[in-house]
Amino acid sequence: WELTILHTNDVHSRLEQTSEDSSKCVNASRCMGGVARLFTKVQQIRRAEPNVLLLDAGDQYQGTIWFTVYKGAEVAHFMNALRYDAMALGNHEFDNGVEGLIEPLLKEAKFPILSANIKAKGPLASQISGLYLPYKVLPVGDEVVGIVGYTSKETPFLSNPGTNLVFEDEITALQPEVDKLKTLNVNKIIALGHSGFEMDKLIAQKVRGVDVVVGGHSNTFLYTGNPPSKEVPAGKYPFIVTSDDGRKVPVVQAYAFGKYLGYLKIEFDERGNVISSHGNPILLNSSIPEDPSIKADINKWRIKLDNYSTQELGKTIVYLDGSSQSCRFRECNMGNLICDAMINNNLRHTDEMFWNHVSMCILNGGGIRSPIDERNNGTITWENLAAVLPFGGTFDLVQLKGSTLKKAFEHSVHRYGQSTGEFLQVGGIHVVYDLSRKPGDRVVKLDVLCTKCRVPSYDPLKMDEVYKVILPNFLANGGDGFQMIKDELLRHDSGDQDINVVSTYISKMKVIYPAVEGRIKFSHHHHHH
């Protein structure tokens, strides 16, 4: 018996087609992805093959103005239209709190939404009961297939699930649910979830009875043969893990942003054992036409987005200096504003010993692309912020050793004075540079804001200590020459859309007046620029 698994993960609000790098589509003939194009391909496969499941491994939420405006209603609507068979909860599904998950998505989805390792307690238990499930048995042709869901147990640090959801260890939570499926005589079981490729492989190895793992969170691109676009494969598709009980378990993921549709064919014997598995992600490029009816629906929903982007979010009573003449040479108040917003977006009081789990932010000055003039009645709109942050990136959470941070700050000024983008803006960090010293030895003071304290204060950076830092995904991926971050990071979790983070902060504050306040200093009285 043959099953075709179609899968997406980490789509992050890319409902419309995008450019090759998953930013805004400019030249339509070169654009990729989007739900209209995805639907064309899915329908083509459904018509051609008998037993097809379309699965999503989480993080549909967060990433473009679509989510900012529609808050998840767009996810339910278009996933229903595409007839997804099941979805696992990702960490970003909790970005607007539990209510922001329940009302727009859990109550509106016409398909099962799954997670076996999230347990509700207190008053939430009855409110959310039945709205998501640990597993779902799906009828596929004359057979049944069990889908068991899982979600990153780091979600309380990455999003806003509140205090009434407990995120258990994935493997511990999955095993009894898989066992329960076995007692229901379900002998073909897919683990569908959002904990990253390393955990996907562990689940394949450790959870007895799981036949296939379909994952997300780490944006992992797997491919067999010559890859069709810019993504470099982390391994073959499917990635085969030998389980502790000796079975070959295929593990798949489909990069991110709806650029690819995962396509995996599994052959089962009559006892539900995997005989063979093969496939590859399908690049959703312009050779695949956009479905006209879905496209028309997208265009209808789009109208509200254009209206939103010109509405006032809040006001500034000071000039927001995002000029390259400032942000690439010295502390600029636009950099301070953005870093303050990044920290504010990551406030999670999950431990009494810590005022917050993260206090530091770094931001490449080259990522700040425009100032905002306060002499327009002080008005700040989404459109204004899109000019400041036009690349459609995210502000991510990483864990780094102090020594890596020191290298990053040395890199920040290694060729100072050439208006290059690597000059770092900061939050929760006080840095002093001495530009008279040779490159690689210019950081003379680096103090960081404590987290395990009731009164936050600045202490010298410790080289061997592990620190959490919020930074743009561009830096986490080694952009602007920050190879040491990419090479040495100990953990990397994708965060919220950059513009959304700043817009939410401005809306919350109502009136802003960021200052230049001595976060970045130069010793030896260097007056540059």
Partner: nanobody
Framework: QVKLQESGGGLVHSGGSLRLSCAVS????????IGWFRQAPGKEREGVSC????????NYADSMKGRLTISRDNAKNTVYLQMNSLKPEDTAVYYC?????????????????WGQGTQVTVSS
């Protein structure tokens, strides 16, 4: 809390009719496919009928085709099963079940929520 409650069962003579109701609470009915099942003493539970979440698709067991009509009233959060020309072999406990999914199925395992059942007895 999700709850399904069957009613309308009872004792009926061969050739008679019954209308079973399945009242659901704790969720909006229009997102759920509802199935009717029956279990006679000493036998496996078997699918009788089903109506998809959109209401556009219905299924009937071969053994009862032409004698059943399934319908749903989303406003009342209730699904009905009209059973005509009943036979003694239709005697069983009738259950309704719900699953959040688009498609009908007669497979017991795919349904997530079940009612307690209502007894239907057809005398000759």
């Amino acid at each position: 809390q999700v709850k399904l409650q069957e009613s309308g069962g009872g004792l009926v003579h061969s050739g008679g009719s019954l209308r079973l109701s399945c009242a659901v609470s704790g969720f909006a009915l229009d997102y759920y496919t509802i199935g009717w099942f029956r279990q006679a003493p000493g036998k496996e539970r078997e699918g009788v009928s089903c109506i998809s979440s959109s209401g556009s698709s219905t299924n009937y067991a071969d053994s009862m085709k032409g004698r059943l009509t399934i319908s749903r009233d989303n406003a009342k959060n209730t699904v009905y099963l009209q059973m005509n020309s009943l036979k003694p072999e239709d005697t069983a406990v009738y259950y309704c079940a719900a699953q959040r999914y688009y498609y009908c199925s007669d497979k017991v395992a795919v349904y997530d929520y079940w009612g307690q059942g209502t007894q239907v007895t057809v005398s000759s």
